[in-house]
């Protein structure tokens, strides 16, 4: 099982939408796949996929989850709020037939406020 996550860095405006993608691949077929999105280490959602469908479509505040065969799990945040800023990680585990798990690399989401003046200090603190 392998998990590739993207993008590494995502910067969006407050009120717009953010899309995080997790590509889950396995050489052999699977019957049930448990997936999990975390933000700053806290679980946003932990549904499973079976018969081509997600057991849950909601993932955290304003988060919508979708599965597109053969391998794309998408988390869409809409509308994005300042609280959505953070480090997101996608994790997956084949539960049936055999337990195997993997996780992606971090996606760092930065949300810019509608009023750019609110953001002046934070932008100045970004590494060059």
């Amino acid at each position: 099982l392998s998990v590739q996550q993207g993008p590494n860095l995502l910067q969006v405006r407050q009120g717009s939408q953010a899309t995080l993608v997790c590509q889950v691949d396995q050489a052999t077929a699977w019957e049930r796949l448990r997936v999990k999105w975390t933000k700053d280490g806290a679980i946003l959602c932990q549904p499973y996929i079976t018969n081509g469908s997600l057991s849950l479509g909601v993932c955290g505040p304003q988060g919508r989850l979708s599965w597109q065969a053969p391998s794309h799990l998408t988390l869409q945040l809409d509308p994005v709020s300042l609280n959505h800023s953070g480090a997101y990680v996608c994790w997956a585990a084949v539960e049936i037939p055999e337990l195997e798990e993997a996780e992606g690399n971090i996606t760092r989401l930065f949300v810019d406020p509608d009023d750019p003046t609110q953001n002046r200090n934070r932008i100045a603190s970004f590494p060059g």
């Epitope: 392998s2 691949d25 396995q26 077929a29």
Partner: antibody, heavy 120, light 113 residues
Framework: QVQLQESGPGLVKPSQTLSLTCTVS??????????WSWIRQHPGKGLEWIGY???????YYNPSLKSRVTISVDTSKNQFSLKLSSVTAADTAVYYC????????????WGQGTMVTVSS | DIVMTQSPLSLPVTPGEPASISCRSS????????????LDWYLQKPGQSPQLLIY???NRASGVPDRFSGSGSGTDFTLKISRVEAEDVGVYYC?????????FGDGTKLEIK
């Protein structure tokens, strides 16, 4: 470009352990998402999957051989190995190493094969 | 284990003529989770290692001539060669990777008439 090369003794005595090594060049064997496999072909016959080891060290073996097979990886040498114990004449075959990936689930690169004869 | 059954076992073909090989699996190789059939086709030319022709039942591998095509779903699959050439001789194998153990068909030997 990935290349695989099998090596090991061409003759093994019955009841002994067959040991083969596959050297991987042009690619890191520890790359996530890849499987390193052994497949054999008895003389004039079809192909038989022996087993594979994945990037995390997980092994999957053909149940028909499971009690006698060990596949391992040596990342420092970029090699993976096959050990088949208690061999008999029925283990005489051409042994191939091959690789496949989670994302592209097929054997796209094969070694040239090495003939192993079990005989006293 | 999933049993792969190929037919015919021998296939004499005249150059320029089409050829068709059938492969049947003892259980479905289609996954509704991924919308994929876990079935590949390989050609083993005389004295060589097998080479990939078709993956996931119908996708031609890189560098494979377009005269080769794969079709089918579930348990019944077909490899077709639209116009056989002399270089196509060898043994054709279907193989599943739906689950472990991975298994191959017995092979179809294509020879030129």
């Amino acid at each position: 470009q990935v290349q695989l090369q099998e090596s090991g003794p061409g003759l093994v005595k019955p009841s002994q352990t067959l040991s083969l090594t596959c050297t991987v060049s042009g690619f890191s064997i520890s790359t996530s998402g890849y499987y390193w496999s052994w497949i054999r072909q008895h003389p004039g016959k079809g192909l038989e999957w022996i087993g594979y080891i994945n990037y995390g060290g997980g092994t999957y073996y053909n149940p028909s051989l499971k009690s006698r097979v060990t596949i391992s990886v040596d990342t420092s040498k970029n090699q993976f190995s096959l050990k088949l114990s208690s061999v008999t004449a029925a283990d005489t075959a051409v042994y191939y190493c091959a690789t496949m990936a989670d994302r592209f689930a097929f054997f796209d690169v094969w070694g040239q094969g090495t003939m192993v004869t079990v005989s006293s | 284990d999933i049993v792969m059954t190929q037919s015919p076992l021998s296939l004499p073909v005249t150059p320029g003529e089409p050829a068709s090989i059938s492969c049947r699996s003892s259980q479905s190789l289609f996954s509704s989770n991924t919308n994929r059939n876990y079935l590949d086709w390989y050609l083993q030319k005389p004295g060589q290692s097998p080479q990939l022709l078709i993956y996931h039942a119908s996708n031609r591998a890189s560098g494979v001539p377009d005269r080769f095509s794969g079709s089918g779903s579930g348990t019944d699959f077909t490899l077709k060669i639209s116009r056989v050439e002399a270089e196509d001789v060898g043994v054709y194998y279907c193989q599943h990777h739906y689950e472990t153990p991975l298994t191959f068909g017995d092979g179809t030997k294509l020879e030129i008439k």
